[in-house]
């Protein structure tokens, strides 16, 4: 019979024949032959392979180094790598999360639009007219100016993006 030019899913072509790939969590020891099946071996502890494969070496689990602010989000297995994230108050510097940096704070005049997570930094936005922020914070949103009218008071000092309005009593008409 003609040797195959393509193989089924979870197979690979070698020496003009189709061999079974090794399942996730196992590595290739020897290719199949006309008489024998593919030989696979489980990955060692702290190693993994996450696909059907013909790899002769397993990959090492990622180390979530606490000295870099990292912690484990998902423990590695024979079929999956360890997933790292950052300690509270920190976020990853890259998608691979190999190190962490402190969450940015939003300066006075800016509020938090989106609170940081283990993988994304704080997103700040300028406080629009009618809102203010007088602190540097990684959590505080812009606060609305106080409404003097609802307290039967009048604006004595206008608000800014960094300060609230100052309310005062209404001037009484003298008799």
């Amino acid at each position: 019979p003609e040797p195959p030019t393509a193989c089924r899913e979870k197979q690979y072509l070698i020496n003009s024949q189709c061999c079974s790939l090794c399942q996730p969590g196992q590595k290739l020891v020897s290719d199949c032959t006309e008489f024998t099946e593919t030989e696979c071996l489980p990955c060692g502890e702290s190693e993994f392979l996450d696909t059907w494969n013909r790899e002769t070496h397993c990959h090492q689990h990622k180390y979530c180094d606490p000295n870099l602010g990292l912690r484990v989000q998902q423990k590695g297995t024979s079929e999956t790598d360890t997933i790292c994230t950052c300690e509270e108050g920190w976020h990853c510097t890259s998608e691979a999360c190999e190190s962490c940096v402190l969450h940015r704070s939003c300066s006075p005049g800016f509020g938090v639009k989106q609170i940081a997570t283990g993988v994304s930094d704080t997103i700040c936005e300028p406080c629009p007219v009618g809102f203010f922020s007088n602190v540097s914070s990684a959590f505080e949103k812009c606060h609305p100016w106080t409404s003097c009218e609802t307290k039967d008071l009048v604006v004595q000092q206008a608000g800014t993006n960094k300060t609230d309005v100052v309310c005062g009593p209404q001037d009484r008409l003298r008799a």
């Epitope: 969590g25 060692g44 502890e45 190693e47 297995t77």
Partner: antibody, heavy 119, light 113 residues
Framework: EVQLVESGGGLVKPGGSRKLSCAAS????????MHWVRQAPEKGLEWVAY????????YYADTVKGRFTISRDNAKNTLFLQMTSLRSEDTALYYC????????????WGQGTSVTVSS | DIVMTQSPSSLTVTAGEKVTMSCKSS????????????LTWHQQKPGQPPKLLIY???TRESGVPDRFTGSGSGTDFTLTISNLQAEDLAVYYC?????????FGAGTKLELK
């Protein structure tokens, strides 16, 4: 037959140090991750530390971080736990446990060694 | 840290009965890569070290009788012992094997009526 035998426990004064050992036999020690887990008198189980088969990966519980050091000697089939700055709350039975590369669970436990921290 | 909550804390039982205990985790124990729930059950008899009973939520360790059944997913898990035997009197601990720090429930103690 898999065997894990802990030793090195005893009475220690607060602030003192102690080094625990766990002698492994009946399996290829260098192929397995290892854990220390403790159990305070009449209490539940508390994970303490982990070391991977090849010494590359080490994790600690926050309660012992900076005070305890896990290590292993694959040539001597022995796991260690160096404990410093001991506190009364470290009083417990300390177990070593094996983690394989398939289940990723603690599949064998030693009998434990008792550490008492008291003045 | 993942908090593991077991209930009840103790159960008074008789031989031959069916026993069910619960374990809840404060976050999902589902590994997104291989779709396995990393929930482990250990059995600890008086004066003995813990013994692995069930891993991946429902897979019995070799040598564990089939009267022990683990079930559940995500955050809610159950251990069932059907036709309870005297030798099953022990404390049963569920454990988060999903992430570090590894955390244990406070245990469910089975006592004879």
């Amino acid at each position: 037959e898999v065997q894990l035998v802990e030793s090195g426990g005893g009475l220690v004064k607060p602030g003192g140090s102690r080094k625990l050992s766990c002698a492994a036999s009946g399996f290829t020690f260098s192929d397995y991750g290892m854990h220390w887990v403790r159990q305070a008198p009449e209490k539940g189980l508390e994970w303490v530390a982990y070391i991977s088969s090849g010494n590359r990966i080490i994790y600690y519980a926050d309660t012992v971080k900076g005070r305890f050091t896990i290590s292993r000697d694959n040539a001597k089939n022995t796991l260690f736990l160096q404990m410093t700055s001991l506190r009364s709350e470290d009083t417990a039975l300390y177990y070593c446990a094996r983690q394989d590369g398939y289940r990723y669970a603690m599949d064998y436990w030693g009998q434990g060694t008792s550490v008492t921290v008291s003045s | 840290d993942i908090v593991m909550t077991q209930s009840p804390s103790s159960l008074t039982v008789t031989a031959g009965e069916k026993v069910t205990m619960s374990c809840k985790s404060s976050q999902s124990l589902l590994n997104s890569g291989n779709q396995k729930n990393y929930l482990t059950w250990h059995q600890q008899k008086p004066g003995q070290p813990p013994k692995l009973l069930i891993y991946w939520t429902s897979t019995r360790e070799s040598g564990v009788p089939d009267r022990f059944t683990g079930s559940g997913s995500g955050t809610d898990f159950t251990l069932t012992i059907s036709n309870l035997q005297a030798e099953d009197l022990a404390v049963y601990y569920c454990q988060n094997d999903y992430t570090y720090p590894l955390t244990f429930g406070a245990g469910t103690k089975l006592e004879l009526k």
